[in-house]
């Protein structure tokens, strides 16, 4: 960056190199060039010369003043016009940053995705800080009082093998940057209560054209958890509102769920599960699309209807690399 240049003087920022966005700041430049009493001192921001709010303080120093500085990052440097020099002489440069102190982290959530071997902790960091902000996740055993700390820039994955202090823990998050530090409320967790079952996946769908067409959705999960509650939501792609069906599920076999849907309409399905009675849900599965067939013309003959049923005309959809849904309401 600009800070690596060879300096023939000094550049500094008041109140600091990293400051709160919207502040008034002063940038000072002091030349220390051999055989040079500068006739002029110039400031550049991101390579563009500044023309206003420059004050010459003394023979070697000048000040550039900014009101309400709102840029997250800027590269500043200053130059001197030295007598007998036809080109400006570089004095020094500095990268400056503006931003905000961190908000108090809230909505701290820790879950264990089945088979992951990790406890994943996330939180709402609040408003964008614009500057480098680090988070320390504190995990304290309620049984042994032992505390572990994990440094991260966003979320954290903690190996469950490292959680040796029993099943009950307190978790809290400290956020810190150059402008301040905040700490979340403490979250009490029990490792057995935060497991999210292995992802439920819709594998295929078929519509059987009978007297009343019926769509069967096939879905499964590799979970070993015995008591699992699931929700399947579906809607016509043209609709805004979802219909939701609830299931108590045993995943020892592939699940089949029946729906009576309108003909010749494209539907979208998603499923999610949780360990029954626990707090956290899986994120909704990938979007699964299925278009129902057009209605078979109704004929009064029962036999014909029966034959139509026996003909077993089906329309099937299978799952292949679906679009990922938005994850609103993923956990909790």
């Amino acid at each position: 960056g600009i800070t690596n240049i060879n300096c023939s003087g000094h550049i500094w920022v008041e109140p600091a190199t990293i400051f709160k966005m919207g502040m008034n700041i002063s940038i000072y430049c002091q030349a220390a060039i051999k055989n040079c009493q500068p006739r002029k001192l110039h400031f550049y921001k991101n390579g563009i010369k500044e023309r206003f709010q420059i004050t010459r303080i003394n023979k070697t120093t000048a000040r550039l003043w900014y009101k309400n500085f709102l840029e997250p990052h800027a590269s500043m440097y200053c130059t001197a016009e030295c007598p007998k020099h036809f080109q400006e002489t570089l004095i020094c440069g500095k990268d400056i940053s503006s931003g905000y102190p961190p908000d108090i982290p809230d909505e701290v959530t820790c879950v264990i995705y089945e088979y992951s071997g990790n406890m994943t902790c996330t939180w709402n960091a609040g408003k964008l800080t614009y500057i480098d902000t680090k988070y320390v996740v504190h995990v304290k055993s309620l049984e042994t009082e032992e505390e572990q700390q994990y440094l991260t820039s966003s979320y954290i994955n903690i190996s469950t093998d490292s959680l040796q202090g029993g099943k009950k823990y307190l978790v809290w998050v400290q956020a810190a940057n150059a402008l301040g530090m905040e700490e979340s409320k403490q979250l009490q967790i029990h490792l057995d209560d935060i497991v999210i079952p292995s992802a439920a996946v819709i594998s295929r769908a078929e519509t059987i054209n009978a007297t009343v067409p019926k769509t069967i959705i096939y879905w499964d999960s590799q979970t070993t958890i015995e008591k699992v509650s699931c929700e399947m939501r579906y809607k016509a792609t043209t609709n805004q509102t979802w219909n939701v069906k609830e299931f108590d599920t045993n995943f020892t076999y592939v699940q089949q769920s029946e729906f009576y849907l309108e003909p010749n309409i494209k539907y979208v399905f998603q499923v999610r599960c949780q360990e029954t009675g626990k707090r956290y849900w899986q994120p909704w599965s990938s979007l699964f699309f299925h278009k129902t067939p057009e209605t078979v013309p109704q004929v009064t003959s029962k036999a014909f209807q029966h034959d139509t049923w026996n003909s077993g005309l089906t329309v099937a959809s299978i799952s292949t690399g679906h679009l990922t849904s938005d994850n609103r309401g993923d956990i909790g």
């Epitope: 006739r39 010369k49 023309r51 016009e81 007998k84 020099h85 036809f86 080109q87």
Partner: antibody, heavy 118, light 115 residues
Framework: QVSLKESGPGMLQPSQTLSLTCSFS??????????VGWIRQPSGKGLEWLAH???????YYNPALKSRLTISKDTSKNQVFLKIANVDTADTATYYC??????????WGQGTTLIVSS | QLVLTQSSSASFSLGASAKLTCTLS???????IEWYQQQPLKAPKYVME???????STGDGIPDRFSGSSFGADRYLSISNIQPEDEAIYIC?????????????FGGGTKVTVL
Amino acid sequence: QVSLKESGPGMLQPSQTLSLTCSFSGFSLTTFDMGVGWIRQPSGKGLEWLAHIWWDDDKYYNPALKSRLTISKDTSKNQVFLKIANVDTADTATYYCARLQGSDFDYWGQGTTLIVSS
Amino acid sequence: QLVLTQSSSASFSLGASAKLTCTLSSQHSTYTIEWYQQQPLKAPKYVMEVKKDGSHSTGDGIPDRFSGSSFGADRYLSISNIQPEDEAIYICGVGDTIKEQFLYVFGGGTKVTVL
């Protein structure tokens, strides 16, 4: 009002020494950041910087001609001098002096022509 | 090596706008240059200085039809509403101290004809 005027011999033979004088008014060569330079231009060709001298007697020469050039000044008379030793036909040109303020040759004399011929 | 490159000639209709280019050698692309005007059989005249950010300051008696700008290693002299008296050779110049030696170089000049 700034003005500069060059004077010289007009004609020289090869191997002679050229002596040029720049007489100026409207500024002083004792003023901080002030200088006077010499530039020449062969007929129909481009400009070539030769030398310049600053208020504090600091002198700069074109590296390609340095061994033949001498610049000096007399601040009391508002004059700057340039000597070019061992002239050759390639030195035939119009010679200009110009005021140097900061980094700009901002005022020029009308020029004096030199012909080197045997 | 410090070099300035200019096209040798350019023609413009009376009252039109002209834009002349002076290109610095690539390793000197941040340098400030000067523009000079040399009318036929006259001494050069200082027009303006153009810095790397396009800022410029004109010499005494230069009409405000003349302006300067910059892009990369190119320095421009623009003349709006060009007049017969603007017919001249326009020369750019640049100075620098390189390896303890000072050098001032001129471009070859662009001859401007007003039609």
